[in-house]
Interface confidence: medium
């Protein structure tokens, strides 16, 4: 229940991704507008995105604070022009939105290939460390700085002349594998946080193959 | 398996200069960052400074206790990390230990054994 | 650089007991203080970080709360495995630990 002019706002979601955290709910609004608060689950509420007409609040400043608690955000409901306007409760609407825990739930974004370099029948393939906007002492941490060793990367390659794909897993930002001498190779990486029971893997990255700029051959 | 380990530590004279060092394997030294923190004898830790990983440049931090006299840098070729210390006094005598320093949590996650420094004339 | 004034300096408690050491910042650390423990001979340990969040595999007999300045870390039940020095640690801005608080049995 609540005033007649308002309605409580309805599919409350999570859209993360590397710890940018922005939540999303409906409907558009029609003459009123929303205020969002979040808070741990032993922690005070603190309100964002004050009275807006839009239906995303991005919260991502509130949980790098600290992105291996739970959250939980709530969505209030004010007329538009009257904002101290309450439901028959004496309180305005509100939703409840599911807990989040970014440590656990947020997406894994898509990686980069930094480069490559071939020596002799080896290759080394380097994985950009992406950096994350958990920040800490003037530092923006990287993906490795925040998951450790919870974080590997799985390389898949193959000839460029076939579509035979072989997979190496490196718990390191690095690969380094085993090629037949005069083969152009093609590499993509995807992130992988195996104990994760949700969101465990990344899509993959852009292609990248040998003979092109990103590399570098070196035949020793 | 992580090791650090280092070595460097000595008697000094108040004024001189010594250069602490820690060896580092079993994990991608460039990915980490790495910290020096001393513990005098019968006193508190204390932080000394740190130097950033890769992807933010090497760059360093230090305490206001220690700024100017001692610089953190790293061979990442080597996988070591060092602790250039001017300028001694007395109160610097304490053991030295390297450790790797999660930011995020501000957790030194693995530590050396300690190398120890004793300024006295 | 801030400052972090721990207390007290030591302490004793017996088995089954319940001990408080609190932190004080010299200025706002935005809850950014970890607790460690500290044995002889072994690399301090992260019990909590962020005021009160248990690093894993730390007991629930650990807490911490606080705000602003002022921390306060607790354990309770009191094990003869906790027998050890605990430090707070702010890293707020750059790090500080604290001066260390000897914990004893009575």
């Known amino acids: 229940s609540g005033t007649t002019n308002t309605v409580a706002a309805y599919n409350l979601t999570w859209k993360s991704t590397n710890f940018k955290t922005i939540l999303e709910w409906e409907p558009k609004p029609v003459n009123q507008v929303y205020t969002v608060q979040i808070s741990t689950k032993s922690g005070d509420w603190k309100s964002k995105c004050f009275y807006t007409t839009d239906t995303e609040c991005d919260l991502t400043d509130e949980i790098v604070k600290d992105v291996k608690q739970t959250y939980l955000a709530r969505v209030f409901s004010y007329p538009a022009g009257n904002v101290e306007s309450t439901g028959s409760a004496g309180e305005p609407l509100y939703e409840n939105s599911p807990e989040f825990t970014p440590y656990l739930e947020t997406n894994l974004g898509q990686p980069t290939i930094q480069s490559f370099e071939q020596v002799g029948t080896k290759v080394n393939v380097t994985v950009e460390d992406e950096r994350t906007l958990v920040r800490r002492n003037n530092t923006f941490l990287s993906l490795r700085d925040v998951f450790g060793k919870d974080l590997i990367y799985t390389l898949y390659y193959w000839k460029s002349s076939s579509s035979g794909k072989k997979t190496a897993k490196t718990n390191t930002n690095e690969f380094l594998i085993d090629v037949d001498k005069g083969e152009n190779y093609c590499f993509s990486v995807q992130a992988v946080i195996p104990s994760r029971t949700v969101n465990r893997k990344s899509t993959d990255s852009p292609v990248e193959c040998m003979g092109q700029e990103k590399g570098e051959f070196r035949e020793i | 398996e992580v090791k650090l380990v280092e070595s460097g530590g000595g008697l000094v004279q108040p004024g001189g200069s010594l250069r602490l060092s820690c060896a580092t394997s079993g994990f991608t030294f460039t990915e980490y960052h790495m910290s020096w923190v001393r513990q005098p004898p019968g006193k508190a830790l204390e932080w000394l400074g740190f130097i950033r990983n890769r992807a933010n440049g090497y760059t360093t931090e230090y305490s206001a206790s220690v700024k100017g006299r001692f610089t953190i840098s790293r061979d990442n070729s080597q996988n070591i990390l060092y602790l250039q210390m001017n300028t001694l006094r007395t109160e610097d005598s304490a053991t030295y230990y390297c450790?790797?320093?999660?930011?995020?949590?501000?957790?030194?996650?693995?530590w050396g054994q300690g190398t120890t420094l004793t300024v006295s004339s | 650089d801030i400052q972090m004034t721990q207390s007290p300096s030591s302490l004793s408690a017996s088995l089954g007991g319940e001990v408080t050491i609190t932190c004080k910042a010299s200025?706002?650390?935005?809850?950014?203080i970890a607790w460690y423990q500290h044995k002889p001979g072994k690399g301090p340990r992260l019990l909590i970080h962020y005021t009160s969040t248990l690093q894993p595999g730390i007991p629930s007999r650990f807490s911490g709360s606080g705000s602003g300045r002022d921390y306060s870390f607790s354990v309770s039940n009191l094990e003869p495995e906790d027998i050890a020095t605990y430090y707070c640690l702010q890293y707020d801005n750059l790090l500080t630990f604290g001066a260390g608080t000897k914990l004893e049995l009575k």
């Open positions: 200025q706002d650390i935005n809850k950014y």
């Open positions: 450790a790797r320093l999660t930011m995020v949590v501000a957790e030194f996650d693995y």
